[in-house]
């Protein structure tokens, strides 16, 4: 006769492991007992369980409640056992020793591999600001057995570096993603992808990038100076900028206080019907937590009466 078993049995942490051991014997042969033992190198064989044809299933106190025979129907030549709720410490070599009548004893070894799926964690790096050099955007760590694979999925251009720490029964892998921050990266996803044989599918953790920046400020509304004349209604200046975090706007007048009737509405400065009093230098001050910018414009409100007088003077001068 001969023993049929597996070289390697692989289970995920917490699953039940079936340790196979089947005696393929000649007709008339009987199995008296099947003894299962841990057979790791450097330690004496530690009995796990013993299936006896007459006395039944015996279980080592160290494995009490965790070793069972497979559910019926059972073949009397089948010495397989179930190891319930596999833990990392169960990983190792096991020996099945079958005592038969009249052929004698047979033994076989198998290796139990317990996969420990990783629980990845993603840690964002320091605040990203435009103008920085190569900066850590995020690091992703996953520990498992065997060592997991940690990669990045993103449209953002960057560099990755990985390091691994081996523990007694597992390994921790940390991957870092570095980039040169730019405003175009704002809102872009950076996804850590963890692969492992104990996972049905890759685990993914996504971090949304936030890059602090503040664009140059500019003022719109003075494109046509001829519209800025005495009596015009609805005249306004609009301050243009963008930033992360979104900036706040403040309007001042360089050569004095804002004239009465001028309304500040965020990025917009609204004027009442224009008078020459509204002429002056206006400053838009844009700021966020990252930076601040200024843009100034000169408003020159034309008085048609003065203009016509000047024109007459010019004509008469010629």
């Amino acid at each position: 006769g001969e023993l049929e078993t597996s070289d390697v049995v692989t289970v995920v942490l917490g699953q039940d492991a079936k340790l196979p051991c089947f005696y393929r014997g000649d007709s008339g042969e009987q199995v008296g007992q099947v003894a299962w033992a841990r057979a790791d190198a450097g330690e004496g064989a530690q009995e796990l369980a013993l299936l006896h044809s007459k006395y039944g299933l015996h279980v080592s106190p160290a494995y009490e409640g965790r070793v069972e025979q497979p559910p019926p129907p059972r073949n009397p030549l089948d010495g397989s056992v179930l190891l319930r709720n596999a833990v990392q410490a169960d990983e190792g070599e096991y020996e099945c020793r079958v005592s038969t009548f009249p052929a004698g004893s047979f033994q076989a070894r198998l290796r139990l591999r317990v996969l420990v799926p990783p629980l990845p964690s993603l840690n964002p790096g320091p605040a990203l600001e435009e103008g920085q050099g190569l900066t850590l955007a995020a690091s992703c760590t996953a520990e498992g057995s065997p060592a997991p694979s940690v990669t990045w999925d993103t449209e953002v251009k960057g560099t990755t570096s990985s390091r691994s720490f081996k523990h007694s029964r597992s390994a921790a892998v940390t991957s870092e993603f570095h980039l040169v921050p730019s405003r175009s990266m704002n809102g872009q996803p950076l996804t850590c992808v963890v692969s492992h044989p104990g996972l049905l599918q890759d685990q993914r953790i996504t971090h949304i990038l936030h890059v602090s920046f503040l664009a140059e400020a500019s003022v719109r509304g003075l494109e046509d100076q001829n519209l800025w004349h005495v009596g015009r209604e609805g005249a306004m200046l609009k301050c243009l900028s963008e930033g992360q975090p979104p900036p706040s706007y403040n309007w001042t007048r360089l050569d004095g206080p804002l004239p009465s009737g001028v309304r500040v509405d965020g990025d917009t400065l609204g004027f009442p019907p224009l008078t020459t009093e509204h002429s002056g230098i206006y400053v838009c001050h844009v700021s966020n937590e990252f930076s601040s910018r200024d843009s100034q414009v000169t408003v020159d409100v034309l008085d048609p009466q003065e203009d016509s007088g000047k024109q007459v003077d010019l004509v008469s001068a010629s």
Epitope: Q30, G32, Q33, A35, A37, Q46, E47, L48, A49, L50, H52, K54, Y55, H58, V59, S60, P61, E64, S99, T100, F101, P102, G104, S105
Partner: nanobody, 122 residues
Framework: QVQLVESGGGLVQPGGSLRLSCAAS????????MGWYRQAPGKQRELVAT???????NYADSVKGRFTISRDNAKNTVYLQMNSLKPEDTAVYYC????????????????WGQGTQVTVSS
């Protein structure tokens, strides 16, 4: 030929304790499983508890948590500590064992002792 000699039986009140011993002799080979069966009047012989030379245990559901089996391999002796005894534990308790043969093969023969009476009654 293996001889099994039991001792420790007797009369005990419900809730009491007894300790049975069984010594195996006459064997030049390794004793494999040792343990205890019992037979109440008019009933079939049933397993109580057995223990392997490697220390693995097998208990009948009816005695789990009350009875403890232990073994001294060097002395080829098995013990059964019986606590919280009940009237239904009344029976003749038989020691049992098997052994490996001269080539290290398991012998198909099961050996039995003469039995020791345990009576639980008030």
């Amino acid at each position: 030929q293996v001889q099994l000699v039991e001792s420790g039986g007797g009369l005990v009140q419900p809730g009491g304790s007894l300790r049975l011993s069984c010594a195996a002799s006459g064997s030049d080979f390794t004793i494999n499983v040792m343990g205890w069966y019992r037979q109440a009047p008019g009933k079939q012989r049933e397993l109580v508890a057995t223990v392997t030379s490697g220390g693995s245990l097998n208990y009948a559901d009816s005695v789990k948590g009350r009875f403890t089996i232990s073994r001294d391999n060097a002395k080829n002796t098995v013990y059964l500590q019986m606590n919280s005894l009940k009237p239904e534990d009344t029976a003749v308790y038989y020691c049992t064992a098997d052994q490996f043969g001269p080539l290290g093969h398991l012998s198909p023969i099961i050996y039995w002792g003469q039995g020791t009476q345990v009576t639980v009654s008030s």
